[in-house]
Interface confidence: medium
């Protein structure tokens, strides 16, 4: 007997062909011998089956000896053996209908688990294999679980159900809710305006929730809430902001914060959390601020950085167009009795300059000028 696999909610067409290429009498019945549909002359007739309003044929092909049974909006319980009676012959087709659903929302927070559940007819023993958007394969039976979802798991998951050497394919769109970057670092000279951006890695029509930026300044003993805000249909409104520093926040996505001035006392690490409506858990993005200051006090030219720097970063002081006078993997470097000229303080990583501050050293009878 022929086996046909169908997908819940889809349409299936079961074929039945007569040897005579003309319209003759036919009937489709289920395994309980209940008539589903057939013909009476040129008219389609329907029986008392539960498929009544979802069953159809292809009237246009009857004249060619084709008498299909079309079942729309398939249900798991439509799985059955269907019998076509034509020309004193019986053609049997076994229909197996499967469904695959994500049994949580398809919008999941980074780090959460995804569970896919297969609905299958009694007596079937299907195997399921799913391929994630990043090419990872997972196999299972009635349920498949993926823990610790990552950003790269966003997209279309393709799942293949195998039964009787036949397959049916499901596609499920999964959206992993996360910020585009888990962490970012901003390098600024003292006094410069600081822009923090927190772009989301997903787009949804309506986005509602609330968020907060906690800040741990390097010089402070404890962290402090710098700003709290609400998000309603992608519109941002500030609820509370500290007086020092007085952050400003953009009214539209992506989430955008402005610190009027980079100062040593603000250097440190922040954690922006976003709690989305109807979701358990929060989105997180870490942000770091490194501040540089170059100063000349009497006969000492000093360059300092504050904030979370990696131990491999190099801090250097050099006279313009000359070799570095001093270069150390430390957070402060200095030169005693510096020559007159334009000095550069450089923070670099493997030769790539991350931050630069220039200071003009005047001959000893003058006071220094900071450009």
């Amino acid at each position: 007997k022929k086996v046909v696999l169908g997908k819940k909610g889809d349409t299936v067409e079961l074929t039945c062909t007569a040897s005579q290429k003309k319209s003759i009498q036919f009937h489709w019945k289920n395994s309980n011998q209940i008539k589903i549909l057939g013909n009476q002359g040129s008219f389609l007739t329907k029986g008392p089956s539960k498929l009544n309003d979802r069953a159809d044929s292809r009237r246009s092909l009857w004249d060619q000896g084709n008498f299909p049974l079309i079942i729309k909006n398939l249900k798991i319980e439509d799985s059955d053996t269907y019998i076509c009676e034509v020309e004193d012959q019986k053609e049997e087709v076994q229909l197996l209908v499967f469904g695959l659903t994500a049994n949580s929302d398809t919008h999941l927070l980074q780090g959460q688990s995804l569970t896919l559940t297969l609905e299958s007819p009694p007596g079937s023993s299907p195997s399921v294999q799913c391929r994630s958007p990043r090419g990872k394969n997972i196999q299972g039976g009635k349920t498949l679980s993926v823990s610790q979802l990552e950003l790269q798991d966003s997209g279309t998951w393709t799942c293949t159900v195998l039964q009787n050497q036949k397959k049916v394919e499901f596609k499920i769109d999964i959206v992993v809710l996360a910020f585009q970057k888990a962490s970012s670092i901003v390098y600024k000279k003292e006094g410069e305006q600081v822009e923090f951006s927190f772009p989301l890695a997903f787009t949804v029509e309506k986005l509602t929730g609330s968020g907060e930026l906690w800040w741990q300044a390097e010089r402070a003993s404890s962290s402090k809430s710098w700003i709290t805000f609400d998000l309603k249909n992608k519109e941002v409104s500030v609820k509370r902001v500290t007086q020092d520093p007085k952050l400003q926040m953009g009214k539209k996505l992506p989430l955008h914060l402005t610190l009027p001035q980079a100062l040593p006392q603000y250097a440190g690490s922040g954690n922006l959390t976003l709690a989305l409506e109807a979701k358990t858990g929060k989105l997180h993005q870490e942000v770091n601020l490194v501040v540089m200051r170059a100063t000349q006090l009497q006969k000492n030219l000093t360059c300092e950085v504050w904030g979370p720097t990696s131990p491999k970063l190099m801090l250097s002081l050099k006279l313009e167009n000359k070799e570095a006078k001093v270069s150390k993997r430390e957070k402060a470097v200095w030169v005693l009795n510096p020559e007159a000229g334009m000095w550069q303080c450089l923070l670099s990583d493997s030769g790539q300059v991350l931050l630069e501050s220039n200071i003009k050293v005047l001959p000893t009878w003058s006071t220094p000028v900071q450009p």
Epitope: V4, K7, T11, E13, T15, S57, R59, S60
Partner: antibody, heavy 118, light 107 residues
């Protein structure tokens, strides 16, 4: 929702053959039939034939008998329509459409322009 | 083959007008009649099947009626997006055949 994506435009010489593909996604490929319909420039719609889903049996309009071949590849969810012995009057946009039987063609490909010119 | 004849072949109407397009089959086709809308450079779109059943997602201003040989597509209040060409099609007997189309233009 079923999506049908067709191959790109073709330019052919009279007497040659053309093979147009129609790739299905978003549904169970083997569960529905595909009809092929063409439309000459500025003209109406003309049904060419249908390929049955599970068995791959076909039924063609008499006008195209012997010139049109419809095939399917279940592994790639693709249906093909090959038209041979092309003539200038075969210049048209060729569409594949999901055919739900007596409830009509409810999903169409974007169309493939075939130009037959010497 | 069953011939399908549509009338008129074109018509001019204004937004808000009630528009009626007719389709006649050369023999009885019961209710096996479908209506499609096609815009320039686009594939046809199913509007109505089995003479009077509205396809899901199609606005309720579209309606179909008829049985046997005479069928009608009605747009109760024409909207700017309705200016297009409309085709009827029979699914009673192969080869499936379409009407010649009715182009609905802005007056």
């Amino acid at each position: 929702q079923v999506q049908l994506v067709q191959s790109g435009a073709e330019v052919k010489k009279p007497g040659a053959s053309v093979k147009v593909s129609c790739k299905a996604s978003g549904g169970t490929f083997s569960s529905y039939a595909i009809s092929w319909v063409r439309q000459a420039p500025g003209q109406g719609l003309e049904w060419m034939g249908i390929i049955n889903p599970s068995g791959g049996s076909t039924s063609n309009a008499q006008k195209f008998q012997g010139r049109v071949t419809m095939t399917r590849d279940t592994s790639t969810s693709t249906v093909y329509m090959e038209l041979s012995s092309l003539r200038s009057e075969d210049t048209a946009v060729y569409y594949c459409a999901r055919d739900l039987g007596d409830t009509a063609m409810d999903g169409w490909g974007q169309g493939t322009l075939v130009t037959v010119s010497s | 083959d069953i011939q399908m004849t549509q009338s008129p072949s074109s018509l001019s109407a204004s937004v808000g007008d009630r528009v009626t397009i007719t389709c006649r089959a050369s023999q009885s086709i019961d209710s096996y009649l479908n209506w499609y809308q096609q815009k320039p450079g686009k594939a046809p779109k199913l509007l109505i099947y089995k003479a009077s059943t509205l396809e899901s997602g199609v606005p309720s201003r579209f309606s179909g009626s008829g049985s046997g040989t005479d069928f009608t597509l009605t747009i109760s209040s024409l909207q700017p997006e309705d200016f297009a060409t409309y085709y009827c099609q029979q699914s009673y007997s192969a080869p499936l055949t379409f009407g010649g189309g009715t182009k609905v233009e802005i007056k």
